[in-house]
Each structure stands twice: as C-alpha cells, then as structure tokens.
C-alpha cells in the first residue's frame, strides 16, 4: 500500500510530556501516581491506526465494488454483443431491429417466468421460517446490544468451560507463588532471630552449657 503511515506503524512515538501550564495537568499529577504503567499506544497513535484501518476498509470496499462492476460487465458482454453496424445497410439494420425486438420479447418472457419462480421461492421460505419458529415454541430472539467486555470475559465467551479452567489455573499459580515468597521471608526472619539470640548472654550461656 503506497501510504506514508506504514513506517509509523513500525515504531510507536512516545507521548509528549504534559506541559505544566494548565491546572488540569497538576490535577493529573495529583490523582495519578507517577509510577503508573503508561498505555502502550498513545491516543494520537490510536487515532492514526483507526484512520489507517478505515482507509484499508474503504479500499477493500472500493475493490469489491470494482470487482462487482467488472463481473457485471463480463456477464453483459457475454449476453449482449456490441452493435456491429459498420457496413450494414438500411435493410440489415431494419432486420436487426426486428431481431433485437424479438430477443427483447423473449428475454421479457424469461424474466417474467424467473420473477414468478423467485416470488414462489420467497413465499416458500417465509412459510418454512414460520414453521421453524412454531416448532421452537415461538422463541423470540432478544435484540442484541453492544456491551463492553473484559479480556477474560471475552475468553470465557469464546472458549467456554475451557477458558474458565485456564483462568482458574492462572489464579492458582499466582496464589502458590505468593505463598512461596511469604514462606521464604518467614525463614529469613527466623534465622536472623537465632543469630541475635546466640550473640547475647543467653547464647553464650547456652553455648557454655552445651
């Protein structure tokens, strides 16, 4: 794609530091801790990517439309030959008009028959659809609304029970890791206590007695 934004897509630019002029900037410093992990993509970059995606989508749609036009052209060229009038006399042109009128009449008849078939099919489809709904116990599909969804919830929705297992496992792994670090900390603490105890009189006494 001959577009200038392709290089920008490779290396995200760092967001410029806020200019300390407006009170809103200070409010941001007050409410958000400085150590907070910054978003990987800046707002401007997000916008740039969105624009790029829209551009790609637009090009795709245009390409599809062009393909459809080409397909239509090809279909018409096979059905309708170009008028080759060069050298044909008045007699042939009159005859040709008769031929074309006859062809138009024939095509009209065919179109009428096809339309009748299509109407019949539509009616049949409608009847069958109704029967399906009747068999389902007149089940009415709820209207779908857009909802915000977390990554975990999306995973769960996509993978079902398997996702739940993997999520539980991940939580379990985190838990185990936490317990291990606590245990290590406890052991380190006890060892220090022991050293302190031995270094005092009590320790000397115990040492002497032993």
């Amino acid at each position: 794609m001959a577009d200038g934004s392709s290089d920008a897509a490779r290396e995200p630019r760092p967001a410029p530091a806020p200019i300390r002029r407006r009170s809103s900037n200070y409010r941001a410093y007050a409410t958000e801790p400085h150590a907070k992990k910054k978003s990987k993509i800046s707002a401007s970059r997000k916008l740039q990517l969105k624009t790029l995606l829209l551009q790609i989508a637009k090009q795709e749609l245009e390409r599809e439309a062009e393909e459809r036009r080409g397909e239509k052209g090809r279909a018409l060229s096979t059905r309708c030959q170009p008028l080759e009038l060069a050298g044909l006399g008045f007699a042939e042109l009159q005859d040709l008009c008769r031929q074309l009128h006859a062809r138009v009449d024939k095509v009209d008849e065919e179109r009428y028959d096809i339309e009748a078939k299509v109407t019949k099919n539509i009616t049949e489809i409608a009847d069958l659809t109704q029967k399906i709904f009747d068999l389902r116990g007149k089940f009415k599909r709820p209207t779908l609304r857009r909802v915000r969804i977390s990554a975990d919830a999306m995973m769960q929705a996509l993978l079902g029970a398997r996702a739940k297992e993997s999520l539980d496992l991940r939580a379990h792994l985190k838990q185990v890791k936490k317990e291990d670090t606590e245990k290590e900390n406890r052991e380190v603490g006890d060892w220090r206590k022991n050293i302190d105890a031995l270094s005092g009189m009590e320790g000397r006494k115990k040492k002497f007695e032993s």
């Epitope: 050298g87 006399g89 008045f90 007699a91």
Partner: antibody
Framework: EVKLEESGGGLVKPGGTLKLSCAAS????????MSWVRQTPEKRLDWVAT????????FYPDSVKGRFTISRDNARNTLYLQMNSLRSEDTAMYYC?????????????WGQGTLVTVS | DIVMTQSPSSLAMSVGQKVTMSCKSS????????????LAWYQQKPGQSPKLLVY???TRESGVPKRFKGKGKGTKFTLTISSVQAEDLADYFC?????????FGAGTKLELK
C-alpha cells in the same frame, strides 16, 4: 487494392454438403459486413447471406435458412459459407461481396466467384 | 419480399446513342428519415463479376464514367447511359437495399448493333 478470392466450389450430389471460403485482402476485413450472392445459370442474382463485421449478426433469405451457415474468421481475413442439404436449385456461381462504407450502400466489391453444381 | 422488375430485358444500341433502362420496385425504397432511396445499379460484363455503378439511386460510385446517370425515387428508377461505348456491352442489374431479403431485378442485357 481490394481483393476477394472464393474457393471450395465443385460438383456435389443432392443432399450433400460443401464449404466455400473467401480470402480477403487490401482492406481492414474486420471493419466490414460481408455477404454471399449467387448467380444462377439463367443469370439471375440471388442474395444468400450477410454477416456483420464482428460476426454477431447474421441474415439469410428463407430459401437457405436452416441449410446454409455464414461465418467469418477476422484473424484469418476469411469468410465462409457452409452449405448443407444441397438441392439442384442451389446450382450457381457463388460470389463473396464486401459491403460499402457505412454512409453508403450496396455491394462495393465482388470476388470472381466459385461454381457450385448440385447434380 | 420486395419484387424488382426491370425493363426491357434486352436492348441493341449503336455506339454514341443514349440508352435508358427502367427498374420498378413493388414498394417504396425511400427512407423518409434521410430522404435516400435504397437502390443500386450493377454492371456485369461477359465472364466477369458484377460491378457497382450507382447507389442511393443517383450517387455514382467512384471511378464510374460520368455518362452513367441514375434517377428516380420511391418505386420508379432509371439508369441512363448518355453516349453508349463499346465497353458498355454488359448486363445491368438493379438491387434494392431497403429491406431483407435483398432482391435483384432480372437484368437488362445491353447489346451493340
């Protein structure tokens, strides 16, 4: 110089078939409508068939419709006439003719002819 | 079908004489949209193929001598040779190019005295 040369004529039995050819030169063949015209032994001229420049449109008199087929090969600059179910009344000198320019009328150029005898 | 009738079927003329031959159609050959009559005249010399002389009833084909003149409109047409020459010895055919099937007259045979 416009040149039209017919070939393929000969003696054939009634009910037989024959294919005539007409080699064209000296003009842009694919730009002109072409026709076959025959002349009976009594010197009467009969129009046999016409084909448009690209071959999409074809015209015949009732006397040959369903028996004769006109066709052309623009790549080879050749006009054809396939004659099936030949009858004694088809005996004639067969000429291939080039139509005039679009703003004019009539058969501007004729070949020397090829003789077809059905007997 | 349009029937083309030519008269006379033959004529014998001396060199330098004026000749007029006639051609009648069973229906009008006039195209009202362009006011042109779709009639052509052909000359066929012995042992040769036909040659176009006149189209649109009165338009002389390029290379055709001026002594050949076509006239008429609707259903009545004539071909006149103002001063017959020895090389004009031939059969002359009229043809309608107004409607299919394209039809020819039976011809007029020009002979020299």
């Amino acid at each position: 110089e416009v040149k039209l040369e017919e070939s393929g004529g000969g003696l054939v039995k009634p009910g037989g078939t024959l294919k005539l050819s007409c080699a064209a030169s000296g003009f842009t063949f694919s730009s002109y409508a072409m026709s076959w015209v025959r002349q009976t032994p009594e010197k009467r001229l009969d129009w046999v068939a016409t084909i448009s420049s690209g071959g999409s449109y074809i015209f015949y008199p009732d006397s040959v419709k369903g028996r004769f087929t006109i066709s052309r090969d623009n790549a080879r600059n050749t006009l054809y006439l396939q004659m099936n179910s030949l009858r004694s009344e088809d005996t004639a000198m067969y000429y291939c003719a080039r139509h005039h320019n679009p703003d004019k009328s009539g058969f501007a150029y004729w070949g020397q002819g090829t003789l077809v005898t059905v007997s | 079908d349009i029937v083309m009738t030519q008269s006379p079927s033959s004529l014998a003329m001396s060199v330098g004489q004026k000749v007029t031959m006639s051609c009648k159609s069973s229906q009008s050959l006039l195209n009202s949209s362009n006011q042109k009559n779709y009639l052509a005249w052909y000359q066929q010399k012995p042992g040769q193929s036909p040659k176009l002389l006149v189209y649109f009833a009165s338009t002389r084909e390029s290379g055709v001598p001026k002594r050949f003149k076509g006239k008429g409109k609707g259903t009545k047409f004539t071909l006149t040779i103002s001063s017959v020459q020895a090389e004009d010895l031939a059969d002359y055919f009229c043809q309608q190019h107004y409607s299919t099937p394209l039809t020819f007259g039976a011809g007029t045979k020009l002979e020299l005295k």
